[in-house]
């Protein structure tokens, strides 16, 4: 196997590799730096393995995976040193590296010249005390949302930020506005930003308006 690659968004984490097998199968092992190897995806002919269940046990740990190659019909086949042939993955630290999924604007509510915009707090597969944690639960104040907003009638954008999931912004009365949000993890050096959310505009179904 080669080209071992971690594909991870909001902690849903899959290890991918090449090539498509012809006459052999793969088994994947994963461990933390200090832990024991755990086998997953036994003798599979797939070129991916979902390792989410393992990495969500501690998203701040650094993980290493390896992919063993076994010729079909001979799972005892070994390399020259008497061990099955395998390839190591790059190290992967979920908390620092998982991609931020595209956020969603849950709602917006206008009261006079103020609009409250709420970002959906997406549920992750990270668990604590048998409950799934939200993105905000996992990242806390490490997660910022940036709001872009603009009058429907103009191209000039404004921005605001929050380390909660809510924005309270000033708007001109009688004007319709459009909104888009982006998630950011300031402490990161890579995979810092999500893609922009879909644009939501006042006058559509997500909004509430009160005088």
């Amino acid at each position: 196997a080669f080209n071992l690659t971690w594909i991870s968004t909001d902690f849903k984490t899959i290890l991918e590799w090449q090539p498509k097998p012809t006459n052999y199968t793969y088994t994947v092992q994963i461990s933390t730096k200090s832990g024991d190897w755990k086998s997953k995806c036994f003798y599979t002919t797939d070129t991916e393995c979902d390792l989410t269940d393992e990495i969500v046990k501690d998203v701040k740990q650094t993980y290493l995976a390896r992919v063993f190659s076994y010729p079909a019909g001979n799972v005892e086949s070994t390399g020259s040193a008497g061990e099955p042939l395998y390839e190591n993955s790059p190290e992967f630290t979920p908390y620092l590296e998982t991609n931020l999924g595209q956020p969603t604007i849950q709602s917006f509510e206008q009261v006079g010249t103020k609009v409250n915009v709420t970002v959906e707090d997406e549920r992750t597969l990270v668990r604590r005390n048998n409950t799934f944690l939200s993105l905000r639960d996992v990242f806390g104040k490490d997660l910022i949302y940036t709001l872009y907003y603009w009058k429907s009638s103009s191209s000039g954008k404004k921005t605001a930020k929050t380390n909660t999931n809510e924005f309270l912004i000033d708007v001109d009365k009688g004007e319709n506005y459009c909104f888009s949000v982006q998630a950011v993890i300031p402490s990161r050096t890579v995979n810092r930003k999500s893609t922009d959310s879909p644009v939501e505009c006042m006058g559509q179904e997500k909004g509430e308006f009160r005088e």
Partner: antibody
Framework: QVQLVESGGGVVQPGRSLRLSCKAS????????MHWVRQAPGKGLEWIGL????????IYDPKFQGRFTISADNSKNTLFLQMDSLRPEDTAVYYC??????????WGQGTPVTVSS | DIQMTQSPSSLSASVGDRVTITCKAS??????LNWYQQKPGKAPKLLIY???SLADGVPSRFSGSGSGTDYTFTISSLQPEDIATYYC?????????FGQGTKLEIT
Amino acid sequence: QVQLVESGGGVVQPGRSLRLSCKASGFNIKDYYMHWVRQAPGKGLEWIGLIDPENGNTIYDPKFQGRFTISADNSKNTLFLQMDSLRPEDTAVYYCARDNSYYFDYWGQGTPVTVSS
Amino acid sequence: DIQMTQSPSSLSASVGDRVTITCKASQDIRKYLNWYQQKPGKAPKLLIYYATSLADGVPSRFSGSGSGTDYTFTISSLQPEDIATYYCLQHGESPYTFGQGTKLEIT
């Protein structure tokens, strides 16, 4: 290491245009928001605007909207400030800065622009 | 737009003195306030972010406090190398705005 180097400043006549560059090294600009800030001689700092180079979103102080344009070339890891219809009051040192969302953590050394006939 | 009123515009103090600068925002900026130090001919340098957090490598004599609309920057014991101009910056919403600056001199 992280570095921002501005260039393109100089003396220009009123009404003319000038394009400033900010070459980044040690990081990818598309991973950050990038800003332009200026400082007139003996005066304070003044925010011009920002760009998210990944998607091209730009935000300006309204006083610069329409006359100044921020852009980025991700392949060259470079930020630009296009300044049109320049006025004497645009005379300043122009800085680019990297924004990690809690603060501007790196600044360029600044490039001076003088608008004079 | 949010206005930032910084005071004083200049101040003179002695080595070892406690120095305080304030910034008042025209509306709640939710602690999205930074303090920068600028020396002549140089780019600004970050000292304090998110109103109260000390930036990496910055001496502990510098501190920040405040929330809502009122923010304070303090140098607990002024040193000769602290001679500079200090600026606050709100970045909670655009347009981002700097305070007018405080020029600090030693008597």
